[in-house]
Amino acid sequence: MAVTACQGLGFVVSLIGIAGIIAATCMDQWSTQDLYNNPVTAVFNYQGLWRSCVRESSGFTECRGYFTLLGLPAMLQAVRALMIVGIVLGAIGLLVSIFALKCIRIGSMEDSAKANMTLTSGIMFIVSGLCAIAGVSVFANMLVTNFWMSTANMYTGMGGMVQTVQTRYTFGAALFVGWVAGGLTLIGGVMMCIACRGLAPEETNYKAVSYHASGHSVAYKPGGFKASTGFGSNTKNKKIYDGGARTEDEVQSYPSKHDYV
């Protein structure tokens, strides 16, 4: 029950996080005109990853896309790439995690398969969240650098007469959305990985169990295949001690691929 709750919550948190990453990537307000200690203008500039906008006091907003690819700063391209990678990984992770959910039955999928898928989606969510956080942080760092550079030469003029006031940009809403969304995706991924441990068969694995009965013999293999004797349904992953039943390598367990989580 706790595993299902952890997995379900991890899925929901990651879903919200990825929705946030998509929203942040599409938002225009990655950087906004700094209004503090600046001459008051009748226009408000803000920029996103894909276009820059100007909102006038008149109520009109004009947005222009960055129609060049080669002319854009390498840092902006890197941020775009990180955000897109984050979205793609997150989307794949969501797809995988839907099939991995314990509450959803798909054919005769075993718990071990669901555990693998849960772990895979968890890792994808973690990487997706890290990509988003990295992308937003790179952009924020770029803004901070440009902010202090433009502050240093805020007023550029000739002969001492002020000619141009440079527009300074500060953190926009998209950065905060991106940070929070990346964090949520990361947390969701960690929860999925934790849930994976609960889903993985952690009991001792056995090579085979031979049961000697008068009429016939039944072999039990680790993983608990249903036997035709009628009681196979409750032998799944359980030790069998009955009459002449003998377990081989009783104390030996094999390291599972999930043990390192």
């Epitope: 009748a42 226009v43 100007v54 006091s57 008149s58 109520g59 009109f60 222009r64 000619q163």
Partner: antibody, heavy 118, light 113 residues
Framework: EVQLVESGGGLVKPGGSLKLSCAVS????????MSWVRQTPEKRLEWVAT????????YYPDSLKGRFTISRDNAKNNLYLQMSSLRSEDTALYYC???????????WGQGTLVTVSA | DIVMTQSPSSLTVTAGEKVTVSCKSS????????????LTWYQQKPGQPPKLLIY???TRESGVPDRFTGSGSGTDFTLTISSVQAEDLAVYYC?????????FGAGTKLELK
């Protein structure tokens, strides 16, 4: 058709108050930036106040800040200018205007005359 | 505050003549965000409110004859009337629409010779 009709002007004593109204038709007042502009007897144009489109931010010249207040009533589609502590230099023809691209003043009313005199 | 300096203050012309009115601002009216210059030109005839001619320094308002042309960027702007007509006799104002307070030039009065 866009129409702006100012009212509320008149003769007022120095230190007095006056509220100008602008009845708007042909567009929704909330969607556009609106301003008051005055023209002095010497024909000089002076910007008085602006309320931004789609928002509530207001702007005034430093000389009028605290004395003049621009507001709008979206339900009535009206723009107002509350003037207090009036001085003789506030004597002018007051125009109600709607902002357009480039924050330009595209639509003007016919104006209402405010005379501040003892 | 941004100071808008218009010249000449008055101009006597003959019909068909080319007229140039200059407007200088104390600071650049160019916005880096959209590469537009926030300068507007108005025409005011006696007994009427001002009429918008040109916004964004060079964009002609609809219905304005194409003999009116706005040009310039940064701090130096020009209004050109390619061939003055009798109905163009009026006062022309330039305006800073970028910085608050929004300021106007003193005006240029166009008179017929």
């Amino acid at each position: 058709e866009v129409q702006l009709v100012e009212s509320g002007g008149g003769l007022v004593k120095p230190g007095g108050s006056l509220k100008l109204s602008c009845a708007v038709s042909g567009f929704t007042i909330n969607n556009y930036g609106m301003s008051w502009v005055r023209q002095t007897p010497e024909k000089r144009l002076e910007w008085v106040a602006t309320i931004i489109g789609g928002g509530s931010s207001t702007y005034y010249p430093d000389s009028l800040k605290g004395r003049f207040t621009i507001s709008r009533d979206n339900a009535k589609n009206n723009l107002y200018l509350q003037m207090s502590s009036l001085r003789s230099e506030d004597t002018a023809l007051y125009y109600c205007v709607r902002l357009y691209f480039g924050n330009s003043f595209a639509y003007w009313g016919q104006g209402t005359l405010v005379t501040v005199s003892a | 505050d941004i100071v808008m300096t218009q010249s000449p203050s008055s101009l006597t012309v003959t019909a068909g003549e080319k007229v140039t009115v200059s407007c200088k601002s104390s600071q650049s009216l160019s916005n880096s965000g959209n590469q537009r210059n926030y300068l507007t030109w108005y025409q005011q005839k006696p007994g009427q409110p001002p009429k918008l001619l040109i916004y964004w320094a060079s964009t002609r308002e609809s219905g304005v004859p194409d003999r009116f042309t706005g040009s310039g960027s940064g701090t130096d702007f020009t209004l050109t009337i390619s061939s003055v007509q009798a109905e163009d006799l009026a006062v022309y104002y330039c305006q800073n629409n970028y910085f608050y307070p929004l300021t106007f030039g003193a005006g240029t009065k166009l008179e017929l010779k």
